[in-house]
């Protein structure tokens, strides 16, 4: 659970009230607009040396990582999960997020993505699991068996507001980001827009929904006139390099 991640995490501090209650499970009391996105979970201590980063879901990890128990089968100490390095081409997998960018999980193996038929979230996953396959057929290796694609199916990329699995599912100018309990395509941030600066790459921690990253040529930096603000309230915006 999210609680076990918090208990075992030294990287998270100053947890704001809305996530402090309800067992770390935000409820309907949290209602925010894009201009004032809830920033819970992005106030981290600097990690001088790399240490395993606790997580609850894949999107809390970097783009080249996924969230899992340190050893498959063992739930880890108290069920703790950490960010692990993504699996390269031809390595075994159980879901898309385990595979490194540019690959997806097919037949329990990380395979290169063919974007002409890579699914966008809203399009049914039969695109990669194939039409008419038997979802009850157990694979011999313990992974779900997926049938081989016999034809390419062309689909437009997800527009803003579309459910997605990863950013490659979204149209240009959009990224795939958490939105409460789903992930949807959201606009990549423009110059001057408020961004979320994570102390460690990919540490999306406890955000109930994420912003995209800053667009090309932009970096997420402390806004000039906010340098004097306290550490916990520094405003970051997308600025030219």
């Amino acid at each position: 659970t999210l609680n076990s991640v918090l208990i075992n995490s030294n990287a998270i501090k100053n947890l704001p009230p809305p996530l402090g209650g309800a067992g770390g499970q935000p409820g309907s009391a949290v209602s925010v607009a894009p201009g004032v996105l809830y920033e819970g979970g992005n106030k981290y201590q600097t990690l001088d040396n790399y240490q395993p980063y606790p997580c609850a879901e894949d999107e809390e990890c970097g783009s080249d990582e996924y969230c899992s128990s340190p050893s498959r089968g063992a739930a880890g100490v108290g069920g703790v999960q950490i960010c692990l390095a993504c699996r390269k081409r031809r390595k075994r997998c159980m879901r898309h997020a385990m595979c490194c960018p540019g690959n997806y999980c097919k037949n329990g193996i990380c395979m290169p993505s063919d974007h002409s038929h890579f699914p966008r979230g809203e399009i049914e996953e039969s695109i990669i699991e194939n039409l008419g396959n038997d979802h009850n057929a157990a694979a011999g290796d313990g992974y779900p068996r997926r049938t081989t694609l016999t034809s390419k199916i062309y689909h437009t990329k997800g527009q803003e507001g579309s459910v997605c699995l990863r950013s490659s599912d979204c149209a240009a100018g959009l990224c795939c980001a958490r939105h409460f309990w789903s992930k949807i395509c959201k606009p990549v941030l423009k110059e001057g827009q408020v961004c979320t600066k994570h102390k460690r790459k990919g540490s999306h921690g406890l955000e109930i929904f994420q912003r995209c990253y800053c667009g090309e040529g932009l970096a997420c930096r402390i806004q000039k006139d906010h340098h004097q603000a306290s550490n916990s309230s520094r405003l970051h915006t997308c600025q030219r390099h």
Epitope: T1, L2, V5, Q25, P26, G27, S28, A29, V30, S31, V32, A33, P34, G35, A56, E57, D58, C67, R95, H96, G121, E122, E124, E125, S126, E129, H135, P144, Q159, E160, G161, S162, V163, L165, H179, F180, W181, S182, K183, I184, C185, K186, P187, I208
Partner: antibody, heavy 115, light 108 residues
Framework: QVQLVESGGGLVQPGGSLRLSCAAS????????MTWVRQAPGKGLEWVSG????????YYADSVKGRFTISRDNSKNTLYLQMNSLRAEDTAVYYC????????WGQGTLVTVSS | DIVLTQSPATLSLSPGERATLSCRAS???????LAWYQQKPGQAPRLLIY???NRATGVPARFSGSGSGTDFTLTISSLEPEDFAVYYC?????????FGQGTKVEIN
């Protein structure tokens, strides 16, 4: 094709409990957040609860918070809604649906809370 | 909470006519996080439009969604007999997710 099948509904007395199940098939279950929505007889739709793909994040409407618990078993491709301290106003058809905008729905299961 | 108000409550039209359904949000949604559903008696709702204007898989081209901010519209360009039903809008910008009260499209 995507299929969601709810079960577990029925008649229960006020203060009682029920556990609804939603069996999913036709898609990679753990890739998707899931949602419970209800519809009182002759009324409109009301969001009840949502849960992320791994089950780590859960959300509830104020009307059910503290009484209902959403959970999922990804190894069984099943979504659950544990309903405790049921009230007459919880009487409704309960639907499970996929994602935050509900692209696929189950057929619904009727929960009647009455003495 | 964001309140979605649908109008009209009932729309009486004949097959072949154009239907225009309105959904107004009590707050600016900022992003197009709005969906439309169709529900027929005794059936579960069916997603028609998501992201304000994207047609869901298998939805006929006669259904289209538009709008932004607080005002959204579902248009059925030429009503077919099977289109007579109740239509709901839903926002997924903020929690709690909320639905409109519905518009019933009935045969005139």
């Amino acid at each position: 094709q995507v299929q969601l099948v709810e079960s577990g509904g029925g008649l229960v007395q006020p203060g009682g409990s029920l556990r609804l199940s939603c069996a999913a098939s036709g898609f990679t279950f753990n890739n998707y957040g899931m949602t419970w929505v209800r519809q009182a007889p002759g009324k409109g739709l009301e969001w009840v609860s949502g849960i992320s793909g791994s089950g780590s994040y859960t959300y509830y409407a104020d009307s059910v918070k503290g009484r209902f618990t959403i959970s999922r078993d990804n190894s069984k491709n099943t979504l659950y809604l544990q309903m405790n301290s049921l009230r007459a106003e919880d009487t409704a058809v309960y639907y499970c649906a996929r994602t935050i905008y509900m692209d696929y729905w189950g057929q619904g299961t009727l929960v009647t809370v009455s003495s | 909470d964001i309140v979605l108000t649908q109008s009209p409550a009932t729309l009486s039209l004949s097959p072949g006519e154009r239907a225009t359904l309105s959904c107004r949000a009590s707050q600016n949604l900022f992003s197009p996080y709005l969906a439309w559903y169709q529900q027929k008696p005794g059936q579960a709702p069916r997603l028609l439009i998501y992201g304000a204007s994207n047609r869901a898989t298998g939805v006929p081209a006669r259904f289209s969604g538009s709008g932004s901010g607080t005002d959204f519209t579902l248009t059925i360009s030429s009503l077919e007999p099977e289109d007579f039903a109740v239509y709901y809008c839903q926002q997924y910008m903020t929690l709690p997710l909320t639905f409109g009260q519905g518009t019933k499209v009935e045969i005139n």
